[in-house]
């Protein structure tokens, strides 16, 4: 149950997250399961553990195997397993099935292709995108943050899309590539426990006093039309409408999008004329459907305006 497949290419960076979560204060120990040998935490090692992350910088074919992570909570040692496979680089253009991440589908109106696993890495723009090994060019393709947007999707846009980026670790750069198939069709729908894509849990958002600020709550619920799914914001555990602060409003209507082939909803919280007291509030992004409820908490912190005076 708490096992996860991870894969990568030799001589590229690979970062794997422990399938078990835990508080930042919890110790996480990593072991190579076959030998029960502890993974070092010193960054001078090519393979090292860093809290919930296991880093291969760069990866080698011999690194393949099952790695055990143990999250040490005050009451239990919670165990997860990462099944890592490192493959040799292919000389030709074809990306074999075993290197492909989950297929995503798009429609004419909406087509975001997320770069798989990128959130685990310390990367900076630009993100490069390739389709069937050809660099994407043209105004229809827009690399935005960690995803590719294709305008006016056509059936010919189906294919294998590869994102390429650089991971930086202590000044050293490592290449990472990830490939997934993109299809242009309606897929059979299903529903799953909500997954909040944004904001990150316990995120701190910098805002300027007196300026406007937007917070986006974005979650995915499954594929296809969802019978019951909602995202909403709460302030200090209270619905926005009940909180009674007219400066803070949710955007009417929820935007439906499809990313990773999933049905997702966004809800924007607009804060007009940010005040000091807004920094004291707890902002909860809630995502709920028939499977249950998930919440991520955000706090605001003051961003000092840059002084342009000499």
């Amino acid at each position: 149950k708490f096992s996860k497949q991870s894969w990568g290419l030799e001589n590229e960076a690979l970062i794997v997250r422990c399938p078990r979560q835990g508080k930042p204060s919890y110790t996480v120990d990593w072991y190579y399961s076959q030998t029960n040998k502890s993974i070092p935490t010193q960054e001078r090692n090519r393979v090292f553990a860093s809290g919930q992350l296991l880093k291969f910088l760069p990866a080698a074919v011999a690194d393949s195997g099952i790695y055990t992570c143990i999250v040490r909570s005050p009451t239990f040692n919670r165990t997860g397993y990462a099944n890592v496979t490192i493959y040799k680089k292919q000389s030709d253009c074809n990306v074999p099935d075993y290197l492909m991440y989950s297929t995503v589908s798009g429609s004419e109106k909406n087509s975001k292709i997320y770069c798989p696993t990128i959130d685990l890495y310390n990367w900076t723009a630009p993100l490069e995108w390739f389709k069937n090994c050809q660099a994407l060019q043209g105004s229809r393709y827009r690399a935005h943050k960690s995803f590719l947007v294709i305008d006016n999707v056509m059936t010919e846009d189906a294919g294998d899309y590869t994102c390429k980026f650089i991971h930086n670790e202590n000044g050293a750069n490592y290449s990472v590539t990830a490939t997934r198939s993109f299809t242009v069709k309606d897929e059979q729908g299903f529903s799953l426990f909500p997954v909040i894509g944004a904001p990150a849990q316990n995120e701190i958002k910098e805002v300027e006093i007196g300026k406007n600020a937007n917070l986006t709550c974005s979650a995915c619920f499954g594929k296809g039309t969802q019978f019951l799914a909602a995202v909403l914001w709460q302030l200090n555990g209270t619905k926005i409408t009940d909180f009674g602060e007219p400066r803070i409003q949710q955007e009417e209507g929820q935007n439906q999008s499809f990313s990773n082939g999933l049905a997702c909803l966004d809800m924007v919280l607009r804060i007009a004329d940010v005040k000091e007291e807004d920094l004291l509030l707890q902002y909860d992004c809630l995502a709920l459907n028939l499977h249950g409820l998930r919440r991520h908490t955000v706090r605001l912190s003051r961003k000092n305006p840059i002084d342009h005076h000499s």
Epitope: G22, K23, S73, P74, Q282
Partner: antibody, heavy 121, light 106 residues
Framework: QVQLVQSGAEVKKPGASVKVSCKAS????????MYWVRQAPGQGLEWMGA????????AFNQKFKGRVTMTADKSTSTAYMELSSLRSEDTAVYYC??????????????WGQGTMVTVSS | DIQMTQSPSSLSASVGDRVTITCSAS?????MHWYQQKPGKAPKLLIY???KLASGVPSRFSGSGSGTDFTFTISSLQPEDIATYYC?????????FGQGTKLEIK
Amino acid sequence: QVQLVQSGAEVKKPGASVKVSCKASGYTFTDSEMYWVRQAPGQGLEWMGAIDPETGDTAFNQKFKGRVTMTADKSTSTAYMELSSLRSEDTAVYYCTRAFDNDNDDGFAYWGQGTMVTVSS
Amino acid sequence: DIQMTQSPSSLSASVGDRVTITCSASSSVNYMHWYQQKPGKAPKLLIYDTSKLASGVPSRFSGSGSGTDFTFTISSLQPEDIATYYCQQWSSNPLTFGQGTKLEIK
């Protein structure tokens, strides 16, 4: 929605054992550890221990080690807490409880209704 | 074991008052949780991870603190807040609770 339903009140003699059950519903039983907390009449809350229903692993408050047994039946989504060698000071309400998000230990968000155990000769 | 000392052990306040309960830990803890318990009922989680409001809990409840000293506040006391309040640490085994603060209306 998450529900924890406990067995009914018990009256026991000193030296005897009591077994309290806690039936879980509304979530996957093996996804969350189950904790046990007791409260003597007019007193505060005291953590006794916990069980991971998936693995059967247990964690105990040393105060109860050797007297308490925690088990879980995956087929019926039921957790059990058995306390042996009962004495009068074990008279308390016994609660089963679990966290909102298991791996993040973010407080006991779900509670059973409590089971009153009276130890009297 | 980490001992949790709540103060005061009981207090009387008027509707609308600001009420503050403190919890002092015998060793440093990373997070504190706070519960409300009404007679004959199971405890109810109000604040988790020191300062986060549990779902459906009114915003008049808040929490703060770090290390060994933590505070629970009701900004404007309501009649339905009459209960006993407990702090709890989840930083070391055994998990321990404060002895409770009984809140009454004047």
